[in-house]
């Protein structure tokens, strides 16, 4: 659809005569009839297949024609067409004399014709005005013409319909060739697809308007590139939604069970070495001079009874000092000036000569020690009880009183409440400091998973379009993770498909 525009510019009829040569009385009151038709190999009379238009009287004899387009007038003349512009045409322009006011063809005498031109033309859409001049012996007509497309029509022959829009059906303007030019932030064949926030994850994110990034179920973050871990996940991460992959040192379904008490709580004091020995249990290896479960107690250096042969120990800032009894000397009173003749062995110890009587050694009865059998044996000195067990002397022997959860002579064995498989229906057992905990599979609950509650929410395959189903164990519901191109709680709705257009 378009318009053939004809601009009449000047008509010259100096002698004021008709085509017959007869003069007009008093002058030639001139109006024009225009016929536009299909291109003919030889211009011939016949229907004006592309349209006709007439002017009012524009002047007398010779005159220039005013451009009236701005004032809503009829120059240029408009010949609209509603077909594909073929590029070629035949144009006939007749100049007529109007003796009266009635300009209808049937009201005019046939000899009222002043002049007539008939041309074959070639004209592309949107070309600049083409100027032409036709001269005869008596008249001259100067005119120009062009073809433009109607509103919303584009292309080389005005055959492409394009109407700019900014609504649900598209967001575009039209290029000169009729192709769509998307408004900023939109893409796709009909500019219906918003361009999401730069970097928005292709599969996990989507948008309904430009520069937006909305996350699909199971994803979060500005660009929807961070998965959402399982509800209740404490010390864990995910690589796909609803996972709970435990950080180092944590265990259990929700990664809330501490497997690395040493690192997380640093219980050992005074530079002691910490060793994990089970869930929430540890052992501190104290540095010299310290004792206690957490090596929190500072030992006196004399506590280890370093002075032998009945020497008395005195604490000093930088260590200790032994005061030796008569007959002994050395750092620890270990050297004797006595012999067996001096009866140096106490508590029934037997004396044996050494080095030809220059020295001696005492052989002590049970429960006594020391170079002169002067010390009663303290079997707890070496701190033999593991896992914070308390050492008790019991006459000639000793025993360890263990903390809850430990057993064995030296409290070295970890008591597992889970050993007897107390969790029913495939529940997972977790040892705790004071007992155990069962993590139940979907569909079971109770302290020992003995109560049947529901079935696996994903068992009925509720997700459509090959979506992945995740069961939310905390609520016994399912979540569908949709593949790209689908939305909805069950991924049942396709997105982004251009609707069929009415045209």
């Amino acid at each position: 659809s378009g318009v053939f525009q004809l601009q009449l510019q000047e008509f010259i009829n100096e002698r004021g005569v008709l085509a017959s040569g007869r003069p007009c009385e008093p002058g030639c009151r001139t109006f024009f009839r225009v016929c536009l038709k299909h291109f003919q190999a030889v211009v011939s009379p016949g229907p004006c297949t592309f349209g006709t238009v007439s002017t009012p009287v524009l002047g007398t004899n010779s005159f220039a024609v005013r451009d009236d387009s701005s004032g809503g007038g009829r120059n240029p003349l408009q010949l609209p067409f509603n077909f594909t512009w073929p590029g070629t045409f035949s144009l006939i322009i007749e100049a007529w004399h109007a003796p009266g006011d009635d300009l209808r063809p049937e009201a005019l005498p046939p000899d009222a014709l002043i002049s007539k031109i008939a041309i074959q033309g070639s004209l592309a859409v949107g070309q600049n005005w083409l100027l032409d001049e036709q001269t005869s012996t008596l008249t001259r007509l100067r005119y120009s013409y062009r073809v433009i497309c109607s509103d919303n029509y584009y292309g080389d022959n005005c055959s492409r319909l394009c109407k700019k829009r900014n609504d649900h059906f598209g967001h575009y303007v039209c290029q000169p060739d009729g192709n769509l030019s998307c408004l900023p932030g939109w893409t796709g064949e009909y500019c219906q697809q918003p361009i999401c926030l730069s970097g928005c994850h292709e599969q996990n994110g989507y948008c309904s308007k430009p520069a937006e990034c909305l996350c699909r179920p199971g994803w979060q973050g500005r660009l929807c590139n961070e998965c959402i871990p399982h509800n209740g996940c404490r010390h864990g991460t995910c690589s796909t939604p609803w996972q709970c992959t435990c950080d180092e040192g944590w265990g259990g379904l929700f990664c809330d069970q501490d497997l690395n008490y040493c690192t997380h709580h640093s219980p050992c004091k005074n530079g002691a070495t910490c060793s994990n020995s089970g869930q929430r249990s540890y052992t501190c290896t104290c540095r010299p001079g310290y004792t206690g479960v957490d090596c929190e107690l500072e030992l006196s250096e004399c506590d280890s009874n370093p002075c032998r042969n009945g020497g008395s120990c005195k604490d000093q800032e930088d260590g200790y000092h032994c005061l030796c009894p008569p007959g002994y000397y050395g750092l620890h009173c270990e050297h004797s000036t006595l012999s067996c003749a001096d009866s140096p062995c106490f508590n029934g110890g037997s004396c044996r000569e050494r080095n030809q009587g220059a020295n001696y050694a005492c052989e002590c009865p049970p429960n006594f020690t020391g170079s002169n059998c002067e010390k009663k044996v303290d079997r707890c000195t070496s701190n033999p009880c593991a896992n914070g067990g308390q050492c008790l002397n019991r006459g000639p022997s000793r025993m360890c009183r263990c903390r809850p959860g430990f057993t064995g002579t030296y409290c070295e064995l970890h008591v597992s409440d889970c050993a007897r498989n107390p969790c029913a229906h495939g529940g997972t057992c977790h040892d705790l400091e004071n007992g155990l905990m069962c993590t139940c599979p979907a569909g079971f609950s109770g302290r020992r998973c003995e109560v049947r509650t529901s079935i696996d929410a994903c068992a009925s395959s509720p997700c459509f379009n090959r979506a992945t189903c995740y069961t939310d164990l905390s609520t016994d519901t399912f979540v569908c993770n949709c593949p790209y191109g689908f939305v909805g709680s069950r991924c049942e709705f396709p997105v982004g498909l251009p609707p069929s257009f009415p045209w």
Epitope: S44, P45, I117, G121, Q134
Partner: antibody
Amino acid sequence: EVQLVESGGGLVQPGGSLRLSCAASGFTFSNYGMYWIRQAPGKGLEWVAFISHGGGITYYRDSVKGRFTISRDNSKSTLYLQMNSLRAEDTAVYHCAALNWELGIDYWGQGTMVTVSS
Amino acid sequence: EIVMTQSPATLSVSPGERATLSCRASEDIYSNLAWYQKKPGQSPRLLIYAANRLQDGVPARFSGSGSGTEYTLTISSLQSEDFAVYFCLQGSKFPLTFGQGTKLEIK
């Protein structure tokens, strides 16, 4: 008096060239589309080429496309036909004509003979 | 191209009688048809254009009719000067095409 006078015909060897002219007088040459039409000995009339009044449109019959060129000089009221790569089948009397039946115009020249022979 | 077929090839008629010549187009030419008279050594002379319009200066005994693909030239009362070759020409589309001609001879 309307006159169309052709010139430039003659004997030429196959593959040779000729340029025909048609001088117009007695009418406003620049107002009309012009045609070259030929008639081979013992044959009917055959259209050859067309040029619009301003020279913007040209058409040729298939057998001469690429070999013949029609042109016009409105200031000299003259029509031309440049004929290259001539063939024996181009032998004919060549007429120029001004045809515009809408205006009742039908002017023909007497013709010029073109003979293509070795 | 549009093929123009004239009939008959030769027509023998006595002076004063009516002659009817036919021209058929291979497709619709929308009345864009002319009839010419051709005598030896002369240029063709236009008789009828637009299928039925008489050219200025042509006697009224010549008339044309027809539409679409079928066209007729009628000479109502033949004069001696009318014996010649008559051909039709379609001006609807390029290439312009002529009929092969009808020779009108004295019977």
